[in-house]
Interface confidence: medium
């Protein structure tokens, strides 16, 4: 086949700095790409929480459609895929369940969406029948096996790879799942989670002996895997992929994100092959677009692009707007109704907050420890027990006294700035720091003061800042029987806390300095309402998990009264 | 392909400290732990401590806390390790060597190795 | 620390036949899932070379005559059947916990 000259749209070949021909005999592939996209699908903030100022905001589904029907108009081979996680992250999700990516991706015709670890929040039900059951275009996975009588009931409905006709070509879609999803979201005993790179290997081959001869990786596994990926499974041309939420750009960039390499990242196989690497960010604030040239035998010649962003400049589209205003109805009924009942004043305030133990802060730790149960193992009760959380994100309490009725509306005065409950893995010794730190200017009513789960920490705030943590023990994970033991500094140990403290935000640098894994989580709101709808009646008490001592507890008293009159003083005349 | 090199020998005098490099190609320098093991002849291995390549953040060994230090140049692609104050029991083969990605960094690519006499 | 103690400490095995080399821990390296136990094979005068990763993965370009399983405590690497080729010394290495250790290493003859 003779391919078209590329018609790219004129700025964005000059934003490329060239503008770049294919080579004779050359095939060209435009990809365009998602990931990571968390349930946004109206438009954002420039922070990826809720639009304000409409005529600032960026993304959603309308807004994407429109740019994805323009790069269709205008190039001749183009492919819309997407690297996972659609599900988890706003009301959208809490109400529709997934029945809202199916009909939104469907609506913006994708042509293959890789499964990311949050597609299983909702437990495999939960993805087979919104998701799996109604989407009209390939799911996949390759490392991904079910067993028992799961097999049977899920057979055909994800797909290892996928070929697809592309012009007069073909392209091999390979799909894959970070292995650790058993840990991060619910897919229950019945599906093994493969090692990626073992998994793909012979399904790379098998399109191989098909006679496919492009082929893209696409998935959801972080960065360094995709990157591992690219380096070590023969055959893949492209990879695509999402979880680690990495912006990747060429030039200057148009927002506030700080690429983290070049786009594409290209990766040195190990047989030699330029492998050009991708991801989009996340929550749908870019479009992923990269063009591809190949030769005649399908090897890669050149690889070129740039995420585009998707700001207001980009007009939403009129359809897909009017689908989404229709849907919109039921949310806003939702966030009004109940969701549970307190009987007890739940203590939101920044003069407890950032001070003391505070009840709302042992509720949404205990959220966070309950929403992370995974019984994967029998050695271990739990994989996670411990959960920090900065008192400076508690925005508000919820009084008891309206009949207890507690909405996601109130939670949203909580936990009003749209952030996620992670999960990262620590050395004790990280862990230490971050303790230290939280009490390092106590009685400035600052944001860092550390509300806890699964821990017990004593400070002695008589003694110099970086030496006040006294005592400090965590709740064992490997034990029938949980109960508290001293942190170890060189183990390594899960904490489940605010995306805001993985990276860093507080002045927590120490934790993402250190941190040695970190996998994001399920929408903080979420993560509450969900734990309230469950217990139904709630009553979350102060209990010791945060004690205050010195040498002699005369002095420890005195010490604390005169601090705290001090930090009511300092409040009242903010 | 990915390589890491690193010198054959260093011979240097008790009480003295050496530096030994190790270059690495064939891959993003960055995206890769590196570690340093040592072995004495005849013996087994010994892992000394690791370095983050694109931040310089490290997790020693107690044991070489005082012994090792570890250090990266990124625009060279080479992580170093100095060891210091020196006696017979640092000879030995010091290996430096790639870690994978997450928290299952098994060591898939090492170097040579650099051995170590200390001798007056 | 973690100690890990690998036995037997030297073995002798026929062309053709089986290798087992155990490999026990002072305390679980399993991490509520998948165990950080890696095998390694160093023949003499050379750099150790990744065999076996995470307990049971084979490396790429190892030859599936080797096997790895085991979790918890107990980890063994099985080698069937044995080639001229595989006279080295192996050593199993942990990671659950700093600082990473490796066993004291088994020698392995072909007879």
């Known amino acids: 086949m003779c391919p078209r000259a590329a018609r790219a749209p004129a700025t964005l070949l000059l934003a490329l700095g060239a503008v770049l021909w294919p080579a004779a005999g050359a095939w060209e592939l435009t990809i365009l790409h998602t990931n990571d996209v968390h349930s946004r699908l109206e438009q954002t903030s420039e922070d990826s929480s809720k639009c304000v100022n409409a005529s600032r905001c960026m993304g959603g589904v309308a807004r994407l459609f429109t740019k994805v029907q323009q790069i269709r108009r205008a190039e001749p081979n183009v492919l819309l895929l997407d690297a996972g996680d659609q599900y988890q992250g706003t009301i959208w999700f809490t109400v529709y369940k997934g029945a809202e990516v199916a009909h939104f991706m469907n609506a913006l015709r994708y042509d293959a969406m890789a499964l990311g670890n949050h597609e299983f929040d909702n437990g495999v039900e939960g993805l087979i029948e919104p998701l799996l059951k109604e989407a009209k275009f390939p799911i996949l996975s390759a490392n991904i096996k079910a067993k028992g009588p799961l097999a049977s009931q899920i057979s055909g409905l994800y797909l290892p790879y996928k070929v697809l006709p592309v012009g007069d070509e073909v392209v091999g879609i390979v799909g894959y799942t970070s292995k650790e999803t058993p840990f991060l979201s619910n897919p229950g005993t019945n599906l093994v989670f493969e090692d990626e790179i073992t998994a793909l290997q012979p399904e790379v081959d098998k399109l191989k002996t098909l006679n496919v001869n492009k082929i893209i990786a696409l998935g959801h596994s972080g960065f360094e895997m995709d990157k591992l990926i690219a380096q070590k499974v023969r055959g893949v041309d492209v990879v695509v992929g999402g979880h680690s939420n990495t912006f990747l750009y060429t030039g200057n960039p148009p927002s506030k994100e700080v690429p983290a390499g070049k786009y594409p990242f290209i990766v040195t196989s190990d047989d030699g092959r330029k492998v050009p690497v991708v991801q989009a960010y996340a929550f749908g604030k870019y479009l992923g677009y990269l063009k591809i040239e190949f030769d005649e035998r399908g090897n890669v010649i050149s690889s070129h692009g740039n995420p585009i962003l998707l700001n207001s400049s980009i007009p939403e589209d009129p359809s897909i707007k009017a689908d989404i205003n229709k849907w919109r109805i039921k949310l806003d009924n939702y966030s009004t109704q109940e969701l549970g009942k307190t009987i007890v004043y739940l203590d939101g305030s920044s003069q407890s907050c950032r001070f003391r133990e505070c009840n709302m802060g042992n509720l949404i730790c205990d959220a966070m420890i309950n929403n992370n149960l995974r019984h994967t193992d029998e050695m271990f009760w739990n994989h996670v027990s411990m959960c920090i959380l900065n008192g400076g994100g508690i925005r508000s309490p919820i009084d008891e006294r309206n009949n207890g009725t507690i909405t996601w509306e109130n939670l949203a005065a909580v936990l009003p700035f749209g952030g996620t409950f992670d999960l990262v893995q620590l050395k004790g010794s990280t862990l230490k720091k971050a303790f230290e730190h939280s009490v390092h200017r106590y009685g400035q009513s600052t944001g860092e003061f550390l509300q806890v789960g699964g821990i017990h920490v004593v400070y002695d705030l008589s003694r110099k800042p970086g030496d006040r943590v006294v005592k400090l023990d965590v709740l064992c994970t490997k034990c029938r029987v949980p109960s508290y033991d001293p942190l170890k500094m060189d183990e390594v140990y899960k904490v489940i806390l605010p995306n805001f403290l993985a990276n860093g935000g507080d002045g927590f640098q120490m934790i993402k300095d250190e941190l040695l894994r970190h996998d994001s989580g399920d929408q903080d709101i979420n993560v509450v309402s969900t734990y309230i709808s469950k217990m139904k009646v709630i009553y979350p008490a102060v209990e010791g998990r945060i004690k205050f001592s010195t040498g002699s507890h005369c002095h420890g008293s005195f010490s604390l009264i005169f601090l705290s009159l001090w930090a009511v003083i300092f409040v009242l005349y903010q | 392909q990915v390589q890491l090199q690193q010198p054959g020998t260093e011979l240097v005098k008790p009480g003295a400290s050496v530096k030994l490099s190790c270059k690495a190609s064939?891959?993003?320098?960055?995206?890769?732990?590196m570690h340093w093991v040592k072995q004495r002849p005849g013996q087994g291995l010994e892992w000394i401590g690791n370095?983050?390549?694109?931040?310089?953040?490290?997790n020693y060994n107690q044991k070489f806390k005082s012994k090792a230090t570890l250090t990266v140049d990124k625009s060279s692609n080479t992580a170093s390790m100095q060891l210091s104050s020196l006696t017979s029991e640092d000879s030995a083969v010091y290996y430096c060597?790639?870690?994978?990605?997450?928290?299952?960094?098994?060591?898939?690519?090492w170097g040579t190795g650099t051995t170590v006499t200390v001798s007056s | 620390d973690i100690v890990l103690t690998q036995s037997p400490a030297s073995l002798a095995v026929s062309l053709g036949q089986r290798a087992i080399i155990s490999c026990k821990a002072s305390?679980?390296?399993?991490?509520?899932?998948?165990?950080?136990m890696h095998w390694y094979q160093q023949k003499p005068g050379q750099q150790p070379k990744l065999l076996i990763y995470?307990?049971?993965n084979l490396e790429a370009g190892v030859p599936t005559r080797f096997s790895g399983s085991g979790s918890g405590t107990d980890f063994t690497l099985n080698i069937h059947p044995v080639e001229e080729d595989d006279a080295a010394t192996y050593y199993c290495?942990?990671?659950?916990?700093?600082?990473?250790?490796f066993g004291g290493g088994t020698k392995l003859e072909i007879k």
């Open positions: 060597a790639r870690g994978d990605y997450g928290y299952d960094w098994y060591l898939d690519v």
């Open positions: 064939g891959y993003t320098f960055t995206s890769y732990w």
């Open positions: 370095i983050n390549p694109s931040n310089g953040g490290t």
């Open positions: 305390q679980s390296v399993s991490f509520a899932g998948p165990s950080l």
């Open positions: 995470r307990t049971s």
């Open positions: 290495q942990q990671n659950r916990e700093f600082p990473w250790t």
